[in-house]
Protein backbone atom coordinates (compact mmCIF):
# COMPACT_ATOMS: atom_id res chain seq x y z
CA UNK A 1 0.00 0.00 0.00
CA UNK A 2 1.13 3.38 -0.55
CA UNK A 3 1.14 6.67 0.77
CA UNK A 4 -0.40 7.69 4.03
CA UNK A 5 -3.97 6.53 5.02
CA UNK A 6 -5.97 9.15 7.18
CA UNK A 7 -9.65 8.54 8.05
CA UNK A 8 -12.32 11.22 7.86
CA UNK A 9 -14.65 10.71 10.63
CA UNK A 10 -18.24 11.94 10.12
CA UNK A 11 -21.36 11.60 12.69
CA UNK A 12 -24.70 10.93 11.18
CA UNK A 13 -28.34 10.27 12.59
CA UNK A 14 -30.14 7.66 10.73
CA UNK A 15 -33.79 6.57 11.27
CA UNK A 16 -35.27 3.15 10.27
CA UNK A 17 -38.56 1.62 10.79
CA UNK A 18 -38.58 -2.20 11.01
CA UNK A 19 -39.02 -4.14 8.05
CA UNK A 20 -41.27 -7.63 7.74
CA UNK A 21 -37.42 -9.24 7.98
CA UNK A 22 -36.67 -6.87 10.48
CA UNK A 23 -33.42 -3.96 10.33
CA UNK A 24 -31.38 -6.38 8.14
CA UNK A 25 -28.26 -5.79 9.63
CA UNK A 26 -25.43 -8.03 11.50
CA UNK A 27 -22.65 -6.71 13.98
CA UNK A 28 -19.39 -7.60 15.65
CA UNK A 29 -18.12 -5.82 18.30
CA UNK A 30 -18.06 -5.40 21.76
CA UNK A 31 -15.64 -5.74 25.32
CA UNK A 32 -15.67 -9.84 24.52
CA UNK A 33 -15.69 -10.02 20.89
CA UNK A 34 -13.28 -6.70 19.94
CA UNK A 35 -13.58 -6.16 16.20
CA UNK A 36 -10.73 -3.11 15.81
CA UNK A 37 -7.95 -3.38 18.35
CA UNK A 38 -8.17 -1.22 21.02
CA UNK A 39 -11.58 -0.50 20.78
CA UNK A 40 -14.77 -2.68 22.08
CA UNK A 41 -17.19 -0.68 19.81
CA UNK A 42 -19.92 -1.89 17.93
CA UNK A 43 -19.66 -2.44 14.12
CA UNK A 44 -21.65 -3.01 11.07
CA UNK A 45 -20.60 -6.37 9.49
CA UNK A 46 -23.10 -7.00 7.02
CA UNK A 47 -26.15 -5.40 5.50
CA UNK A 48 -28.69 -7.31 4.31
CA UNK A 49 -29.93 -6.80 0.48
CA UNK A 50 -33.91 -5.94 0.61
CA UNK A 51 -33.91 -5.27 4.51
CA UNK A 52 -35.12 -2.02 6.45
CA UNK A 53 -31.11 -0.35 6.45
CA UNK A 54 -30.00 -1.80 2.47
CA UNK A 55 -33.33 0.21 1.43
CA UNK A 56 -32.91 3.37 3.26
CA UNK A 57 -29.19 3.58 2.00
CA UNK A 58 -27.00 5.18 4.63
CA UNK A 59 -25.86 2.61 6.92
CA UNK A 60 -22.45 1.03 5.62
CA UNK A 61 -20.94 -1.99 6.09
CA UNK A 62 -17.76 -0.96 8.22
CA UNK A 63 -19.90 1.89 10.47
CA UNK A 64 -19.68 2.10 14.12
CA UNK A 65 -22.74 2.19 15.31
CA UNK A 66 -22.42 4.85 18.94
CA UNK A 67 -25.98 4.57 20.09
CA UNK A 68 -29.30 3.16 19.87
CA UNK A 69 -32.91 4.66 20.19
CA UNK A 70 -30.26 7.27 22.68
CA UNK A 71 -28.86 4.74 24.23
CA UNK A 72 -25.45 4.48 24.52
CA UNK A 73 -23.52 1.04 23.00
CA UNK A 74 -19.73 1.62 24.47
CA UNK A 75 -18.45 -0.90 27.00
CA UNK A 76 -21.39 -3.11 26.11
CA UNK A 77 -21.05 -7.51 25.98
CA UNK A 78 -21.76 -8.06 22.02
CA UNK A 79 -24.66 -9.82 23.26
CA UNK A 80 -26.53 -7.15 25.18
CA UNK A 81 -25.76 -5.10 22.06
CA UNK A 82 -27.57 -7.84 20.26
CA UNK A 83 -30.21 -7.80 22.65
CA UNK A 84 -30.94 -3.87 23.28
CA UNK A 85 -31.22 -3.61 19.00
CA UNK A 86 -33.67 -6.82 18.98
CA UNK A 87 -35.64 -4.94 21.61
CA UNK A 88 -35.55 -1.24 20.54
CA UNK A 89 -39.23 -1.35 19.10
CA UNK A 90 -40.49 -0.57 15.50
CA UNK A 91 -38.73 3.09 14.77
CA UNK A 92 -35.37 2.67 15.57
CA UNK A 93 -32.66 5.95 16.03
CA UNK A 94 -29.16 5.05 15.17
CA UNK A 95 -26.25 7.36 15.77
CA UNK A 96 -23.40 6.13 13.67
CA UNK A 97 -20.15 6.81 12.58
CA UNK A 98 -18.66 6.76 8.94
CA UNK A 99 -15.06 6.29 8.46
CA UNK A 100 -13.87 7.79 4.91
CA UNK A 101 -10.45 6.40 4.40
CA UNK A 102 -8.43 9.31 2.84
CA UNK A 103 -5.34 8.85 1.32
CA UNK A 104 -2.97 11.52 -0.10
CA UNK A 105 -6.25 13.06 -1.51
CA UNK A 106 -8.57 10.28 -2.81
CA UNK A 107 -11.25 9.21 -0.77
CA UNK A 108 -13.23 6.30 -0.76
CA UNK A 109 -15.36 4.00 2.33
CA UNK A 110 -13.30 2.27 4.35
CA UNK A 111 -14.04 -1.66 3.46
CA UNK A 112 -12.48 -4.73 5.21
CA UNK A 113 -9.60 -5.51 3.45
CA UNK A 114 -6.88 -3.47 2.39
CA UNK A 115 -7.75 0.01 1.53
CA UNK A 116 -8.00 0.62 -2.19
CA UNK A 117 -6.88 4.41 -2.13
CA UNK A 118 -4.95 5.42 -5.56
CA UNK A 119 -1.13 6.46 -4.39
CA UNK A 120 -0.52 9.78 -5.30
CA UNK A 121 2.51 9.17 -8.00
CA UNK A 122 -0.08 7.63 -10.05
CA UNK A 123 -2.09 10.62 -10.69
CA UNK A 124 0.96 13.22 -10.76
CA UNK A 125 2.91 10.84 -13.11
CA UNK A 126 0.72 11.53 -16.13
CA UNK A 127 -0.35 15.23 -15.24
CA UNK A 128 3.36 16.69 -15.22
CA UNK A 129 4.34 14.33 -18.29
CA UNK A 130 1.17 16.31 -20.06
CA UNK A 131 2.59 19.68 -18.79
CA UNK A 132 6.32 18.85 -20.13
CA UNK A 133 4.42 17.68 -23.61
CA UNK A 134 2.09 21.11 -23.88
CA UNK A 135 5.38 23.25 -23.05
CA UNK A 136 7.61 21.63 -25.66
CA UNK A 137 4.16 22.01 -27.95
CA UNK A 138 3.93 25.62 -26.56
CA UNK A 139 7.57 26.89 -27.26
CA UNK A 140 7.70 24.91 -31.15
CA UNK A 141 4.87 27.23 -31.27
CA UNK A 142 6.12 29.85 -30.46
CA UNK A 143 9.96 29.71 -32.53
CA UNK A 144 7.49 28.85 -35.67
CA UNK A 145 5.67 32.22 -35.11
CA UNK B 1 -13.88 -15.72 5.05
CA UNK B 2 -14.62 -18.83 6.77
CA UNK B 3 -13.86 -22.75 5.29
CA UNK B 4 -16.21 -25.79 7.30
CA UNK B 5 -16.02 -28.93 7.08
CA UNK B 6 -18.52 -31.59 9.03
CA UNK B 7 -17.82 -35.16 9.99
CA UNK B 8 -19.19 -37.58 12.33
CA UNK B 9 -22.15 -38.72 10.52
CA UNK B 10 -22.89 -42.33 10.03
CA UNK B 11 -25.68 -45.17 10.14
CA UNK B 12 -26.86 -45.14 13.28
CA UNK B 13 -30.17 -47.69 14.80
CA UNK B 14 -32.90 -45.75 16.05
CA UNK B 15 -32.91 -44.38 20.17
CA UNK B 16 -28.82 -44.40 19.62
CA UNK B 17 -26.44 -41.18 20.35
CA UNK B 18 -23.84 -39.05 17.50
CA UNK B 19 -21.71 -36.51 17.60
CA UNK B 20 -21.14 -34.02 15.23
CA UNK B 21 -18.46 -31.91 14.62
CA UNK B 22 -17.88 -28.95 12.09
CA UNK B 23 -14.20 -27.69 11.89
CA UNK B 24 -13.55 -23.76 10.70
CA UNK B 25 -10.66 -22.60 8.81
CA UNK B 26 -9.90 -18.55 9.84
CA UNK B 27 -8.53 -16.73 13.01
CA UNK B 28 -11.88 -15.00 13.26
CA UNK B 29 -14.38 -17.79 14.40
CA UNK B 30 -15.28 -16.73 17.51
CA UNK B 31 -17.31 -13.49 15.51
CA UNK B 32 -19.34 -15.58 13.60
CA UNK B 33 -22.81 -16.87 14.46
CA UNK B 34 -22.47 -21.09 13.58
CA UNK B 35 -26.13 -23.05 12.82
CA UNK B 36 -26.47 -26.44 11.73
CA UNK B 37 -29.02 -27.45 9.23
CA UNK B 38 -30.05 -30.80 7.79
CA UNK B 39 -31.61 -31.46 4.31
CA UNK B 40 -33.74 -34.76 3.42
CA UNK B 41 -34.71 -36.38 0.31
CA UNK B 42 -36.78 -34.14 -1.45
CA UNK B 43 -37.05 -32.06 1.33
CA UNK B 44 -36.47 -28.26 1.96
CA UNK B 45 -33.06 -27.43 4.11
CA UNK B 46 -34.16 -27.12 8.15
CA UNK B 47 -32.98 -25.30 10.73
CA UNK B 48 -31.67 -27.26 13.12
CA UNK B 49 -29.84 -25.76 16.17
CA UNK B 50 -27.86 -21.97 15.88
CA UNK B 51 -25.09 -20.53 18.42
CA UNK B 52 -23.95 -17.03 19.08
CA UNK B 53 -20.11 -16.19 18.47
CA UNK B 54 -19.52 -16.52 22.11
CA UNK B 55 -21.78 -19.84 22.48
CA UNK B 56 -24.04 -18.39 24.92
CA UNK B 57 -27.01 -18.37 22.84
CA UNK B 58 -28.95 -21.20 21.36
CA UNK B 59 -31.31 -21.89 19.61
CA UNK B 60 -33.13 -25.32 18.65
CA UNK B 61 -35.75 -26.36 15.51
CA UNK B 62 -38.88 -27.58 17.29
CA UNK B 63 -37.88 -31.08 15.79
CA UNK B 64 -34.93 -31.40 17.93
CA UNK B 65 -35.63 -29.42 21.19
CA UNK B 66 -35.05 -31.59 24.22
CA UNK B 67 -32.93 -34.30 21.91
CA UNK B 68 -30.05 -32.48 20.46
CA UNK B 69 -27.17 -29.54 22.00
CA UNK B 70 -25.43 -27.55 20.24
CA UNK B 71 -22.04 -26.44 21.43
CA UNK B 72 -18.76 -24.75 19.94
CA UNK B 73 -14.97 -24.55 21.52
CA UNK B 74 -13.77 -20.96 19.94
CA UNK B 75 -10.28 -21.26 21.07
CA UNK B 76 -10.50 -25.34 18.89
CA UNK B 77 -12.40 -23.62 16.05
CA UNK B 78 -15.13 -26.40 16.22
CA UNK B 79 -19.24 -26.53 16.89
CA UNK B 80 -20.28 -29.24 17.82
CA UNK B 81 -24.07 -31.06 17.82
CA UNK B 82 -24.75 -33.87 20.26
CA UNK B 83 -27.60 -35.88 18.92
CA UNK B 84 -29.57 -38.14 21.50
CA UNK B 85 -32.63 -40.34 21.15
CA UNK B 86 -32.34 -40.23 17.20
CA UNK B 87 -35.23 -41.06 14.79
CA UNK B 88 -35.46 -42.23 12.01
CA UNK B 89 -37.09 -38.78 10.77
CA UNK B 90 -33.89 -37.34 11.53
CA UNK B 91 -32.28 -39.13 8.46
CA UNK B 92 -30.65 -36.51 6.53
CA UNK B 93 -27.48 -34.94 5.18
CA UNK B 94 -26.51 -32.19 8.03
CA UNK B 95 -24.78 -29.00 6.80
CA UNK B 96 -22.56 -26.45 9.24
CA UNK B 97 -23.56 -22.80 8.44
CA UNK B 98 -22.04 -20.01 9.43
CA UNK B 99 -22.05 -15.91 8.73
CA UNK B 100 -20.46 -13.14 10.41
CA UNK B 101 -21.70 -11.44 13.91
CA UNK B 102 -24.66 -11.64 14.84
CA UNK B 103 -28.23 -10.67 13.05
CA UNK B 104 -29.86 -7.88 15.13
CA UNK B 105 -33.53 -9.02 14.36
CA UNK B 106 -35.25 -11.96 15.97
CA UNK B 107 -35.87 -15.45 14.73
CA UNK B 108 -33.32 -14.27 11.45
CA UNK B 109 -30.28 -16.44 12.75
CA UNK B 110 -33.37 -19.14 11.71
CA UNK B 111 -32.96 -18.61 8.19
CA UNK B 112 -31.23 -20.58 5.79
CA UNK B 113 -30.89 -17.24 3.50
CA UNK B 114 -28.95 -15.53 6.42
CA UNK B 115 -25.74 -17.64 6.61
CA UNK B 116 -22.80 -17.20 3.99
CA UNK B 117 -21.21 -19.92 4.89
CA UNK B 118 -21.54 -23.58 4.52
CA UNK B 119 -19.86 -27.05 4.25
CA UNK B 120 -20.46 -30.03 2.14
CA UNK B 121 -22.58 -31.43 4.69
CA UNK B 122 -22.19 -35.08 6.43
CA UNK B 123 -24.91 -38.20 5.99
CA UNK B 124 -26.48 -39.26 8.80
CA UNK B 125 -28.69 -42.57 8.95
CA UNK B 126 -31.20 -43.96 11.46
CA UNK B 127 -32.72 -46.94 10.85
Known amino acids: MNGRVDYLVTEEEINLTRGPSGLGFNIVGGTDQQYVSNDSGIYVSRIKENGAAALDGRLQEGDKILSVNGQDLKNLLHQDAVDLFRNAGYAVSLRVQHRLQVQNGPIGHRGEGDPSGIPIFMVLVPVFALTMVAAWAFMRYRQQL | HVQLVESGGRLVQAGDSLKLSCAASGRTFSTYTMGWFRQAPGKEREFVAGTSPSGDNRNYGDSVKGRFSISRDNARNTMYLQMNSLKPEDTAVYFC?????????????????????WGQGTQVTVS
Open chain 2, 97 to 117: AAFRGSCVDYGCDFRVSQYDY
